[in-house]
Amino acid sequence: TLNSVLNSNAIKNLPPPLGGAAGHPGSAVSAAPGILYPGGNKYQTIDNYQPYPCAEDEECGTDEYCASPTRGGDAGVQICLACRKRRKRCMRHAMCCPGNYCKNGICVSSDQNHFRGEIEETITESFGNDHSTLDGYSRRTTLSSKMYHTKGQEGSVCLRSSDCASGLCCARHFWSKICKPVLKEGQVCTKHRRKGSHGLEIFQRCYCGEGLSCRIQKDHHQASNSSRLHTCQRH
């Protein structure tokens, strides 16, 4: 089961003490069999297993990637998993921890020594799940070394959203990923109805910006399901 497979997942954020302020931010701590936290006059405990469901790597932390934790089990459930360190196996860049990228199925360092001018590298993007590419072959793209030292501007090649400047996200464009603008109010957005469908997009949109959510456009309520337009709207 998911529980047993992922029980090593680190606790993510602690709840506030019972009787504390509602909505009080939790503090990150490391994993332990049961975490003690103050509550009133005695200590309360919280299970260290806190799965975080996701659809895109960008929903996870920078030290995580989004994937189905088991082959065949709990179909459609994707959660944030700890990134893979150097020399660990991978299927796409986001699986590798920051400072590394996926090359020939192994996480390798992306430090300066690996980037003298322009290099060619394999991007093994996973479409829909972690175990397949669109056509079973790797696509090739050119990455610039400077991408690893400055935040990417719009149109820059990226591996993850943290590579992009503020207000941009890393999204698919053909067979690579580039920095694109986070969507503003009124802009068309993609609402993923089917589990894993985001993996099939070759022109991926960013998510809606702060305070906005991707919702059906008012005047499109009567339209057929397939033609309904979603836009970024205020909460």
Epitope: A10, I11, K12, N13, P15, G23, H24, P25, G26, A28, Q50, Y52, P53, C54, A55, E56, E58, E59, C60, G61, T62, D63, E64, G76, V77, Q78, I79, C80, S161, S162, S166, G167, C169, V182, K191, H192, R193, R194, K195, G196, S197, H198, Y207, C208, G209, E210, G211, L212, S213, C214
Partner: nanobody, 125 residues
Framework: EVQLVESGGGLVQAGGSLRLSCVVS????????MAWFRQAPGKLREIVAA????????YYTDSVKGRFTISRDDAKKTVYLQMNSLKSEDTAVYYC??????????????????WGQGTQVTVSS
Amino acid sequence: EVQLVESGGGLVQAGGSLRLSCVVSGGTFSVYAMAWFRQAPGKLREIVAAISRTGSSIYYTDSVKGRFTISRDDAKKTVYLQMNSLKSEDTAVYYCAVDGRANGERPAVAGYNYWGQGTQVTVSS
């Protein structure tokens, strides 16, 4: 100030149903994953169900699969937990938790950083 307010708890007979709601108010952040946890007396607080930002990925703990349904309404900044076929072992205080992030913010590890005060659910046999 951010507030998470749960409602819908109460006393119910075994086999009955309840629908919990949690409204997020205050703050100018985007709500990513949302979850329901529960804590029975003398036990660890455990996750019950969680839903991703887009709603396309949903996690349930084994003991509630097929009985509980989590959903979210982003327009209302609300997360729901529909609980059917309740059992006495479902008796606990239920807490909602969310991941609220400022635009473009991405932590090293994603997690639930805002929590509600809890609502009591008691299932009598």
